[in-house]
């Protein structure tokens, strides 16, 4: 079952799916001046069996000015534009994608791919949020949103994440700014879809990246 809406937006935050549930579709979008090849797929589809999942179909783009089809080539790093919120950059991913049955990895880029990836998520999909550079989270723990089915309708849970800029902080004389201690982090509230391993990795990220302190949904 496809999720009706996109994951919720949070001010000054981006989200990313660390793995994609079977049934997820990714539109084959091309950058300006290019289009899908005539017989090309409209989308890639995450499919699989109990032991292995992968993306069916391949996206291929060709110049709008020519009739020739282009072969699918992975662009060089400098050619890869920053993608939209579903592709947030981080030094390590909170989930070992290969270890999640029924999920696909991030699809590799294709030549002349659009700068934004448009995914169609399915019920049960989880996305993780982090504050954009220059903003910090007011909460601690993993920030996630899950697409759930309730009373026959799909909805995304609201991630408990507030990202604030340093310039907004109000500190006054005599009010000392405490230092966040990386030690003794209490266990986050658990979610049925987050494993201990996920959270440990996320807290490691939090310790190394001020702007990527993930936070958990408040139930």
């Amino acid at each position: 079952e496809l999720c009706d809406d996109d994951p919720p937006e949070i001010p000054h935050a981006t989200f990313k799916a660390m793995a994609y549930k079977e049934g997820t579709m990714l539109n084959c979008e091309c950058k300006r001046g290019f289009r899908r090849i005539k017989s090309g797929s409209l989308y890639m589809l995450c499919t699989g069996n109990s032991s292995h999942s992968s993306w069916d179909n391949q996206c291929q783009c060709t110049s709008s000015a020519t009739r020739n089809t282009t072969k699918q080539v992975t662009p060089q790093p400098e050619e890869q534009k920053e993608r939209k919120t579903t592709e947030m950059q981080s030094p390590m991913q909170p989930v070992d994608q290969a270890s999640l049955p029924g999920h696909c990895r991030e699809p590799p880029p294709w030549e002349n791919e659009a700068t934004e990836r448009i995914y169609h998520f399915v019920v049960g999909q989880m996305v993780y949020y982090q504050c954009v550079q220059g903003y910090r989270a007011l909460h601690r723990g993993p920030a996630e949103s899950v697409c759930k089915m309730t009373h026959g309708k799909t909805r995304w849970t609201q991630p408990q994440l507030i990202c604030t800029g340093e310039m907004e902080t109000s500190q006054f004389p005599g009010e000392e700014k405490p230092q966040a201690s990386p030690e003794g982090r209490p266990e986050s509230e658990t979610s049925c879809l987050v494993t201990t391993t996920d959270f440990q990795i996320q807290t490691e990220m939090a310790a190394t990246m001020e702007t990527s302190i993930f936070t958990t949904e408040y139930q």
Partner: antibody, heavy 116, light 107 residues
Framework: QVQLVESGGGVVQPGRSLRLSCAAS????????MAWVRQAPGKGLEWVAV????????YYADSVKGRFTISRDNAKNTLYLQMNSLRAEDTAVYYC?????????WGQGTLVTVSS | DIQMTQSPSSLSASVGDRVTITCRAS??????LNWYQQKPGKAPRRLIY???SLQSGVPSRFSGSGSGTDFTLTISSLQPEDFATYYC?????????FGQGTKLEIK
């Protein structure tokens, strides 16, 4: 089940101080941002102050900046609001709240009356 | 600070009526808007977040729409328990700000 219980309200003269407390239970207090919201009698709602999970970031409404201080004691699961140089316009019910993005849990509120 | 202006400030309606309350922001707040319901002597209760997402447990007769600076809360068929004061609130930037409220009364 989340429970937030405010205390410390009362009648105070202009220019004096008061400290409000909010005892929290039913969730991992030290993981969550907390806030104070107030509502003057018969009036609307106003965010007063917000504090991050570890107390390292604090945000205040312009109307209370320099007079009010929000703080927390994670070991005691308690949120505080130190109110100095109180004015008549600070008269309100003060609510402690958390779950700032996902539905907000509120306390029952404590009434602060500033009057001579 | 971003000012939030609600209209009307009060309105009378009957059970079964369709009611619309509007909220205007002094500058764009994207879709970062909440709607609350408050009854006398009680803390506010959030009905809608992100302009149009229904809070869990809130009846589907409540809906929200809009973007940028203009937003609406609609109650499709008023029920007796819906008579209360409604507030919009932006969370695009601190300080978060509320509208002045709309008091919904029984006609």
């Amino acid at each position: 089940q989340v429970q937030l219980v405010e205390s410390g309200g009362g009648v105070v003269q202009p220019g004096r101080s008061l400290r409000l407390s909010c005892a929290a239970s039913g969730f991992t207090f030290s993981n969550h941002a907390m806030a104070w919201v107030r509502q003057a009698p018969g009036k609307g709602l106003e965010w007063v102050a917000v504090i991050s999970y570890d107390g390292s970031n604090k945000y205040y409404a312009d109307s209370v900046k320099g007079r009010f201080t929000i703080s927390r004691d994670n070991a005691k699961n308690t949120l505080y609001l130190q109110m100095n140089s109180l004015r008549a316009e600070d008269t309100a019910v003060y609510y402690c709240t958390t779950g700032l993005n996902s539905g907000y849990d509120w306390g029952q509120g404590t009434l602060v009356t500033v009057s001579s | 600070d971003i000012q939030m202006t609600q209209s009307p400030s009060s309105l009378s309606a009957s059970v079964g009526d369709r009611v619309t309350i509007t909220c205007r922001a002094s500058q764009s707040i994207n879709s970062f808007l909440n709607w609350y319901q408050q009854k006398p002597g009680k803390a506010p209760r959030r009905l809608i977040y992100g302009t149009n997402s229904l809070q869990s447990g809130v009846p589907s007769r409540f809906s929200g729409s809009g973007s940028g600076t203009d937003f609406t809360l609609t109650i499709s068929s008023l029920q007796p328990e819906d008579f209360a004061t409604y507030y919009c609130q932006q969370y695009n930037s601190w300080p978060w700000t509320f509208g002045q409220g709309t008091k919904l009364e029984i006609k």
